[in-house]
């Protein structure tokens, strides 16, 4: 498999058949598949070097792994997008052997002077062809030469099979399955041959190809493949339940932010709630996690403005639940990214020198910002797309807080909508779905560069649009939701999470 280890070294060679028998639309489809693969790999913070070859009668090398930009995913994608099926029109035979020789030439080195770490570099060849080679001879001989070069299968004690993977995608109207199977790697419990119809569900294909065991602690990563559970798609999501004898129970959501902490809303708890009465579950697991302590933001005080006629005041409505035992990360349990951390810098593929302010400008620019939250409907977690009103609609969004029960007498809306809040909901630019009571404490998320970054904590809403936990279809335009802006509570997060190795900026 493609071992995505951020500290490892990898070369990926993309080889695309542009011969007559492929056809323009299949060529374009294959290109799109490779673009998606580059993006998927880049989303792991891994920077492999890419080689890019198209071929028909002759190969054309577009990107060499030795080029300075070959590890720049955006640049490689640009080169790939600029390739035309017409590029091989005049010499449109199929010489797969020559194409693989071009890959060999990129991999190779003069006698005795291999590049440093040659024996620690993994090589992945992704060949997209119909297998109908009609000139140059059998391409399998070049695969043997590559294995020889990389010292694979020579030493019984150390066969090094992990260091070469050859994936073959059958593209085109007619595919010679025998030829394709012959070229692909054969490894136990791994799939190295894919068909055209597989390419309709690329996430499923990538799931077969990628070994992410070295990067389970990466924040904001998800799997969207069809066999995945709700928690493959939202692995940070935590369900919180507070049992109060004689008073029933309160349901909230939260987000895993580290191996020991879940971030949620402070209003989910009262000062009287004992740790043993708080149930937290993650990853869709039935068992509850043991709680060590709940840490409230020191400035949170729901009764803080009662004297001023404000019955409930949600400023600084954030809390961290510290778990007794360390979470074991896996594909259904992993952290979400937090603002102003090194993990988020890497997730957004920003330079290491990026400041907190620059992250803020990237994630919360002064405009309508596409975001999402996760809600549970009929026992299923679903993503709801909303827009954070952070530009010219911000004022009107915040003013609608006056329609909230108990806030109608508030003279100045900034009394309840402090600078700590982000506002969503309403009908412009689109009709946003609203949060329900049980969504409180869950993350408000920005999805960028295939990663998920939490920017807010769901706090309160103007209208309860979820009678009996069913969302009403028709909701008034003033149905707004308010979320604690994490950029505004960073000093507290930084202090409480200082031992969690998140690398706050």
């Amino acid at each position: 498999k493609i071992v995505l280890d951020p500290s490892g070294s990898m070369n990926i060679y993309l080889v695309l058949d542009g011969s007559d028998s492929i056809g323009a639309s299949n060529f374009t489809g294959a290109k799109k598949c490779l673009v998606n693969l580059i993006e998927k790999v880049a989303s792991y913070g891994v920077k492999p070097r890419y080689g890019l070859v198209t071929y028909a009668t002759y190969p054309k090398i577009w990107v060499k792994v030795s080029e300075a930009d070959s590890s720049n995913a955006d640049w490689v994608t640009k080169q790939l997008n600029e390739i035309n099926y017409e590029d091989h029109k005049l010499k449109s035979g199929t010489n797969t052997k020559k194409a693989l020789q071009a890959v060999y030439s990129m991999m190779s080195w003069p006698d005795d002077v291999p590049p440093e770490g040659w024996n620690r570099t993994r090589h992945v060849i992704i060949l997209m062809t119909d297998g109908l080679h009609n000139m140059g001879g059998d391409p399998i001989t070049v695969i043997d030469e590559i294995r020889d070069l990389l010292y694979i299968g020579k030493d019984r004690k150390n066969p090094r099979e992990d260091y070469l993977d050859v994936y073959v995608f059958g593209v085109g109207p007619l595919v010679n399955q025998v030829n394709i199977n012959a070229l692909a790697s054969k490894k136990d419990n791994e799939q190295h041959v894919f068909k055209v119809k597989d390419m309709e569900n690329l996430e499923d294909v990538f799931y077969q190809m990628i070994d992410e065991s070295q990067s389970l602690s990466l924040c904001g990563m998800v799997w969207e493949h069809r066999k995945g559970t709700d928690y493959h798609k939202q692995p940070w999501q935590a369900k919180i339940s507070v049992i109060r004898p004689s008073k029933g129970h309160e349901s909230c959501m939260g987000a895993v932010v580290s191996e020991y902490f879940v971030l949620t809303a402070a209003h989910c708890f009262t000062v009287d709630d004992k740790e043993h009465s708080i149930k937290v579950s993650v990853g869709g697991e039935k068992r509850d996690l043991e709680i060590e302590v709940v840490l409230f933001h020191p400035n949170y005080n729901i009764n803080g403005k009662k004297e001023a006629g404000i019955p409930e005041f949600y400023d600084y409505d954030v809390a961290l639940i510290k778990l007794k035992n360390k979470l074991k990360y896996g594909q259904t349990i992993r952290p979400i990214c937090l603002p102003c951390t090194e993990g988020t810098t890497r997730a957004l593929r920003l330079p290491p020198t990026t400041t907190c302010q620059q992250q803020k400008e990237e994630l919360l620019p002064a405009q309508d910002i596409k975001a999402l939250f996760v809600s549970e409907e009929e026992k299923k977690l679903t993503r709801k797309e909303v827009y954070i009103k952070n530009g010219d609609k911000k004022g009107s969004c915040e003013r609608d807080a006056q329609y909230a029960p108990g806030y109608d007498k508030v003279k100045d809306i900034s009394e309840v909508v402090t600078p700590r809040f982000l506002c969503t909901g309403g009908v412009s630019p689109y009709a946003d779905p609203n949060t329900c009571r049980g969504d409180s404490g869950g993350p408000l998320i920005v999805h960028k560069r295939s990663r998920f970054i939490q920017v807010g904590v769901i706090s309160w809403g103007v209208v309860d649009v979820c009678k009996n936990q069913k969302r009403q279809k028709q909701v008034p335009a003033h149905a707004r939701d308010f979320h604690i802006n994490l950029f505004q509570v960073l000093p507290w997060l930084k202090e409480k999470l200082q031992d969690e190795d998140l690398g706050f900026l």
Epitope: V65, V113, P115, E116
Partner: antibody
Framework: EVQLQQSGPELVKPGASVKMSCKAS????????MNWVKQSHGKSLEWIGR????????FYNQRFKGKATLTVDKSSSTAHMELRSLTSEDSALYYC???????????WGQGTLVTVSA | DIVMTQAAFSNPVTLGTSASISCSSS???????????LYWYLQRPGQSPQLLIY???NLASGVPDRFSGSGSGTDFTLRISRVEAEDVGVYYC?????????FGGGTKLEIK
């Protein structure tokens, strides 16, 4: 600190043989190819050959085949070069140099001066 | 064998000014992998050679960034941006594309 310590100067008679050494320290001896380079007085550098200390496999510049023999002693992390049938043409400064992948000869010994004279 | 050619002496340079040393090869040193296997060494008087530049344009560890290497497949240049007294010596180019590895005759840097 990586060091290549070469044996002292040699004064030898024509037709005789000489064996010089290069003791490596500060790194894993078997991990890098050891090379030998000749520098005749006031002249350029000439690559003689290299040896792989891991398995003793040697490769020679055709010009020095039959003239030079490269060997290693892994137990003492020492490379040796023997030159035979010496003539005045072999009078030169001989360097050992460590080859580090494709970075080139990153470390050199201080050289062994061989003088062939009757 | 690949022949490396250098002029025996550089044009005399003044300390603090820049100097260029040239080298050419009888065959292109550009490998099919895209890397050019050309190296520069400096031998100061009475010392062993020292690696300056590897793979045509990469600065070796510990070498001041006053030194830089450039070139095409067969013609190469070593540039010293501000010559200092310690830069005096003989500069050798070498190729590692094909065995036997070969060195140029060396260029002596002359100070005015």
């Amino acid at each position: 600190e990586v060091q290549l310590q070469q044996s002292g100067p040699e004064l030898v008679k024509p037709g005789a043989s000489v064996k010089m050494s290069c003791k490596a320290s500060g790194y894993s001896f078997t991990d890098y190819l050891m090379n030998w380079v000749k520098q005749s007085h006031g002249k350029s550098l000439e690559w003689i050959g290299r040896i792989n200390p891991y398995n003793g496999d040697a490769f020679y510049n055709q010009r020095f085949k039959g003239k030079a023999t490269l060997t290693v002693d892994k137990s003492s992390s020492t490379a040796h070069m023997e030159l035979r049938s010496l003539t005045s043409e072999d009078s030169a400064l001989y360097y050992c140099a460590r080859l580090e992948n494709d970075y080139g000869f990153t470390y050199w010994g201080q050289g062994t001066l061989v003088t062939v004279s009757a | 064998d690949i022949v490396m050619t250098q002029a025996a002496f550089s044009n005399p340079v003044t300390l603090g000014t820049s100097a260029s040393i040239s080298c050419s090869s009888s065959k292109s040193l550009l490998h099919s992998n895209g890397i050019t296997y050309l190296y520069w060494y400096l031998q100061r008087p009475g010392q062993s050679p020292q690696l300056l530049i590897y793979r045509m344009s990469n600065l070796a560890s510990g070498v001041p960034d006053r030194f830089s290497g450039s070139g095409s497949g067969t013609d190469f240049t070593l540039r010293i941006s501000r010559v200092e007294a310690e830069d005096v010596g003989v500069y050798y180019c070498a190729q590692m594309l094909e065995r036997p590895w070969t060195f140029g005759g060396g260029t002596k840097l002359e100070i005015k």
